[in-house]
Amino acid sequence: LVVTPPGPELVLNVSSTFVLTCSGSAPVVWERMSQEPPQEMAKAQDGTFSSVLTLTNLTGLDTGEYFCTHNDSRGLETDERKRLYIFVPDPTVGFLPNDAEELFIFLTEITEITIPCRVTDPQLVVTLHEKKGDVALPVPYDHQRGFSGIFEDRSYICKTTIGDREVDSDAYYVYRLQVSSINVSVNAVQTVVRQGENITLMCIVIGNEVVNFEWTYPRKESGRLVEPVTDFLLDMPYHIRSILHIPSAELEDSGTYTCNVTESVNDHQDEKAINITVVESGYVRLLGEVGTLQFAELHRSRTLQVVFEAYPPPTVLWFKDNRTLGDSSAGEIALSTRNVSETRYVSELTLVRVKVAEAGHYTMRAFHEDAEVQLSFQLQINVPVRVLELSESHPDSGEQTVRCRGRGMPQPNIIWSACRDLKRCPRELPPTLLGNSSEEESQLETNVTYWEEEQEFEVVSTLRLQHVDRPLSVRCTLRNAVGQDTQEVIVVPHSLPFKV
């Protein structure tokens, strides 16, 4: 490309006319401020293309950059451009006008920026000032570009003197923007709502100042748009929040709500979604199984737990034998219902140092205005067995009897055993089980009684021994689900004058 006059900088007189010519081996065009001003294009006989730009009645506003570039998209070195800068000193024009966006300079990192205050005359002295201060900042200035530097978040103005008149530029505002990788979180006041209630969602971005929110939601697909509200939370780092509020939800509002956030500076984006369920009416649903028979061990603490889902939050009551339970002042009973997620609850009844009287029929009832559920079970108090009595007697019949009595809950089993070698028993020799029907030497009779008030079983077992010819160690063992107990007695033959 050949430009005449070649420049690169020209100073022209106001009100004059000036001709710029550009020629090249392909079609060429003059550009001014990204537009093509009226110009004459021609092709010479030797195949050279040219364009002539005639500038008439020049004013200071003609000051600026002019480019000559190839005009075809086939691109003979399409990157080739010739730049010319023209000054038209004009005392009636102070600073060249700026587009509104040039007055706001946004930065995301430490980098040189240019405050683009330009004058029409390259001989003018231009100074840069903070808007609030008179002191000129000694900052590098290029008449074609402006002041270059690393600037803080402040407002700046340029000053020059034309004749005896001091002229100020518009104010330029420098903003350092906080930009980081986008981190979006979405939450809802409630993810389950009844129809007619409100849906309110919040989308929050941390660490960015300039972001764009876009929501997608079921209602949008049917063309019913909702206008979100965006606000700044006043804590650091920067928190920006978009709130989507849908009053009086309908069943069709159930579905996925997505917040898409884009940050235009670095072109980052992130999105998060949340599911909202709109139900016709509230509900209460039991989760998991709770057996109809529950157990607790005497004098131990026991927690009975029921898990359920509900919306809206329910009232929970516990009953024993149809009487309402509450936290006892003595600390024997503790009731608690806690929210483990938005709609999931765990209700617990804790019995502290369980007493026999706490056996009975328990019911948990969870309810609200739309629904209710109840769960019942029988609580059995398990009592470890204890042998209350083990005695030996000599009836007239000549046989010898041993009586064992014990109690426990659930019903205890009784095991009789004997050992004939006292020196080696029971450490070396295992005791022999007694009372089997095949054994003729002994007979067994067992009776079981249930004591309602104490809520436990009593077992009485009598062992009849036919011939005892030497000392015999007889052991009674009671066993149930929560323990065992043993007592021992030495049975001696009739003929021996003593017993141990």
């Epitope: 430490i110 900042l137 900052v139 590098p140 270059s148």
Partner: nanobody, 115 residues
Amino acid sequence: EVQLVESGGGLVQPGGSLRLSCVVSGSSFSSYTMGWFRRAPGKQRELVAGVSTVGDTAAADSVKGRFTISRDNAKNTVYLQMNSLKPEDTAVYYCNTYPHAYLEWGQGTQVTVSS
């Protein structure tokens, strides 16, 4: 981490010359307007001179015509040629981004003008 290392200071007689250098490591030197600052005893730090990324320069009125700033982007270095030094130029000289300092200050280099 960005480091600024200033050198070239010293004791010089009035009317003498010095050339200060500042090497910037670990940063985008070529995208920074760089400059020299100075702090005289008991005074605030002041702007001395700056050079843009394309080589445009500026200097404070007090040093205009005496001090010249330049840069070498290939060496990540900024220079301050100081001629016709005066006793009032005595100070610790620092380089940094300009006119607002965004980098961690270096140790500076002491310039003393005295007969």
